[in-house]
Amino acid sequence: GEGRKTWRRRGQQPAPAPLPPQRTEAAPGTGQPVESFPLDFTAVEGNMDSFMAQVKSLAQSLYPCSAQQLNEDLRLHLLLNTSVTCNDGSPAGYYLKESKGSRRWLLFLEGGWYCFSRENCDSRYDTMRRLMSSKDWPQTRTGTGILSSQPEENPYWWNANMVFIPYCSSDVWSGASSKSEKNEYVFMGALIIREVVQELLGRGLSGAKVLLLAGSSAGGTGVLLNVDRVAEQLEQLGYPAIQVRGLADSGWFLDNKQYRRTDCVDTVTCAPTEAIRRGIRYWNGMVPERCRSQFKEGEEWNCFLGYKVYPTLRCPVFVVQWLFDEAQLTADNAHLTGQPVQEGQWLYIQNLGHELRNTLKDVPASFAPACLSHEIIIRSHWTDVQVKGTSLPRALHCWDRSLHDSHKASKTPLKGCPIHLVDSCPWPHCNPSCPTIRDQFTGQEMNVAQFLMHMGFDVQTVAQQQGLEPSKLLGMLSSGS
């Protein structure tokens, strides 16, 4: 059966602990807090557990009312401007956890696919109403992964102001339509982001130094579609000093040929390019202006593809993408279903990894592990995966350093602080730090060699193709080289 991913902690090597983190200090003569750099993990990557315990106890002792401050909950705020709504006309909103001492703001766009016709939006409304309506949203949400305020779970930005924006527009955060007679649903994804930013200015965002617009899956694509517009909005409102950046997780899709062509009937089977083509019309979808101008009318769907929109963006964007993304494979009808795969499907999957790697060649800030998975940044164990020995929070920290006091990425990477991290091994889970795979029927954990054989992978044939002894290949697979 198909393996399934869970997360495991990696073995830790001891390393010397660095200086403790600083909170904030007043800039001379201004009374304004100046936030120190994120922690520099150069020396600590191995011995994270004991280091984080020290950081946490220090944070608690330094922070007034620390027990309250370490409450993980983000609180729901429905938009005051009730004309900006979810699909069903209920008000959109956001969850917020303020961090008074910080000038960093993290705005996270939730994912959850899309719908692109009356029929499949009806079905979505009937079975996933939370993604189309705010009527039953809970009053609080727990921040996890990059949204966590616990330094051991979020060594990157644990002290930031955290904002989770629920996805209730089903339009990949692109829509700018309003209620009309002919439309049963409204699609306001782009307008929701704009309104959230507008309302957050009154809640402290106006004093921000950095706004990081992050998102996973459809939210990751939403980052690519909206990051420049957010920067422009803040500039126009008189906040040009706020540095706007993007973090797109699992939203970098390819318009490759489907493994098996299917008719565009529903969200699950429709080829993504066709779904987006139809969707843009249905949603009145907006794409970044600089990208739109490169394509003729009716071809705006191209701007939903990371590798086409990215070169047109002005804001720095960090791209996180599994080389074997499950949503891409689902859209390509090449997903693994627990049955051994055919050789053609195996080659298709390998080729997907190769193509994706190529599209990231010129993306200076990227993290792309050779794993079969989907989404990472709000998983609790997002710190576990490494590419070339570097974890994602560490890579993001290096990216921050490379951008320090500048809107553009520095051309020369910082020594010992890499930001372009793309796996070069060719198979799903050839990276040993990938999320654990479990056998779909027994629930047993599998190593990569077991997984590949389980998938019908022919060790003899592949060893021959690679010019290796089968035993050598199995050894390499097990060690992840």
Epitope: R118, Y125, D126, T127, R129, E184, D266, A327, T330, L336
Partner: antibody, heavy 116, light 107 residues
Framework: DVQLVESGGGLVQPGGSRKLSCAAS????????MHWVRQAPEKGLEWVAY????????YYADTVRGRFTISRDTPKNTLFLQMTSLRSEDTAMYYC?????????WGQGTSVTVSS | DIQMTQSPASLYVSVGETVTITCRAS??????LAWYQQKQGKSPQLLVY???NLADGVPSRFSGSGSGTQYSLKINSLKSEDFGSYYC?????????FGSGTKLEIK
């Protein structure tokens, strides 16, 4: 209070037909998807059919496609399941259920026995 | 079609214990999963939707977790009223198949 009440069950000969009804009250019927789910004696739940809110698009399980027809009469707040060419394996308790996020309300069920 | 493999098929436990029931999908269902409880001779009742969200009125001792293809329902400190059968169901494209069920019985 949301209520779903099924009716129309009973004993049917193999090859025969039966029409089940589900009367809905306490909510805006047109705003929810409606499903039929069945449970054979001492067995698990089996999803049978679904009609969407709004457009009324229809979906069936392979085991009943071509033999069963789901429909709704929105003004009368009623869901139907027309069953034809019945087989012994269709013997089950038939439930109607409403969906928004999961099947959040179920009727008490109506029993259908297919036997000669 | 997506298959849902639920385990264990039955579980003998005492009041006060904690139990976990798992459900595996044959492919990624992107958290579009619900859990139901059914007591003998009664209709099923929704417990969890969207893999992790507790339905209205469900006690907080119930919790859902998981993503991708593997999901679980955890019941902390079991009460006598928690005994019965539990089913998972996916909503990622029709047919919306159920798991085969887990019968929770008193030890």
């Amino acid at each position: 209070d949301v209520q779903l009440v099924e009716s129309g069950g009973g004993l049917v000969q193999p090859g025969g037909s039966r029409k089940l009804s589900c009367a809905a009250s306490g909510f805006t019927f047109s705003s929810f998807g409606m499903h039929w789910v069945r449970q054979a004696p001492e067995k698990g739940l089996e999803w049978v059919a679904y009609i969407t809110s709004g457009s009324g698009a229809i979906y069936y399980a392979d085991t009943v496609r071509g033999r069963f027809t789901i429909s709704r009469d929105t003004p009368k707040n009623t869901l139907f399941l027309q069953m034809t060419s019945l087989r012994s394996e269709d013997t089950a308790m038939y439930y109607c259920a409403r969906s928004a996020d999961g099947l959040d309300y179920w009727g008490q069920g109506t029993s259908v026995t297919v036997s000669s | 079609d997506i298959q849902m493999t639920q385990s264990p098929a039955s579980l003998y436990v005492s009041v006060g214990e904690t139990v976990t029931i798992t459900c595996r999908a044959s492919e990624n269902i992107y958290s579009n999963l619900a859990w139901y409880q059914q007591k003998q001779g009664k209709s099923p009742q929704l417990l969890v939707y969207g893999a992790t969200n507790l339905a209205d009125g469900v006690p907080s001792r119930f919790s859902g977790s998981g993503s991708g293809t593997q999901y679980s329902l955890k019941i902390n400190s079991l009460k006598s009223e928690d005994f019965g059968s539990y089913y998972c169901q996916h909503f990622w494209g029709t047919p919306f198949t159920f798991g085969s069920g887990t019968k929770l019985e008193i030890k």
